[in-house]
Interface confidence: low
């Protein structure tokens, strides 16, 4: 029975050219986390495997940094980075938990005047 819940940073916005931390947290379960996948819609960004460590997808290696913790740091943001991001927790014995984050990357002036810039 899956008793856990995923807490995420929810809907966040960041400034073009800046950085953002994507963070998920699995709570309310004693299941062992064997792996966390970070995906952007249908693209794999990164894998954090309990035994193998981090693997960053080559197409993102210049702009994605592992951590902090099981989170993911996106750097040099562009407007094209706007969209849904998923943290997929593979656990034993529970199975798979998925969290969703929506990131909106704003032009600098919009971010400054809109006061929507958030760091999780």
């Amino acid at each position: 029975m899956m008793t856990g819940t995923i807490e995420t940073t929810g809907n966040i916005s960041a400034e073009k050219g800046g950085s953002i931390i994507l963070q998920c947290h699995l709570s309310s379960t004693t299941a062992q986390v064997t792996q966390v996948n970070w995906e952007q819609q249908d693209q794999l960004l990164a894998i954090c495997n309990a035994d193998l460590g981090w693997h960053i997808s080559p197409s993102f290696k210049d702009r994605v940094a592992p951590g902090p913790g099981l989170g993911l740091t996106l750097q040099s943001l562009t407007v094209n980075d706007t969209g849904e991001y998923f943290c997929i927790y593979h656990t034993y014995p529970d199975g798979t938990y998925t969290g969703r984050i929506f990131l909106e990357v704003l032009e600098s002036s919009v971010a400054e005047h809109g006061a929507r810039f958030q760091i999780p």
Epitope: Q35, E39, D42, Q43, I47, N49, I88, H90, T96
Partner: nanobody
Framework: EVQLVESGGGLVQAGGSLRLSCAAS????????MGWFRQAPGKERELVSA????????YYADSVKGRFTISADNAKNTVYLQMNSLKPEDTAVYYC????????WGQGTQVTVSS
Amino acid sequence: EVQLVESGGGLVQAGGSLRLSCAASGFTLENNMMGWFRQAPGKERELVSAIGWSGASTYYADSVKGRFTISADNAKNTVYLQMNSLKPEDTAVYYCAANLRGDNWGQGTQVTVSS
């Protein structure tokens, strides 16, 4: 019990192609991650390619990007690794792994690329 059976390895000349298959039983590809690893003599086992839970998400090591293609057939519970433009440095034993955990491995299939 999870069982993974690789096939498709062999001896091929540089520039040639091979298609590896990994048939999984006791395990469903859906909502899981499958990976291909390789281990050359005297080297550590390295992740070559992986396919994500959605089937559309893929990972490739820099050394094989643009040459290797991973795919999955959920109906057959099989993962494939199409290897094109093979190089001598691709010579290794190739293993598939369930969910990249490192606790379920196949027996491996030898790939030898001659120059």
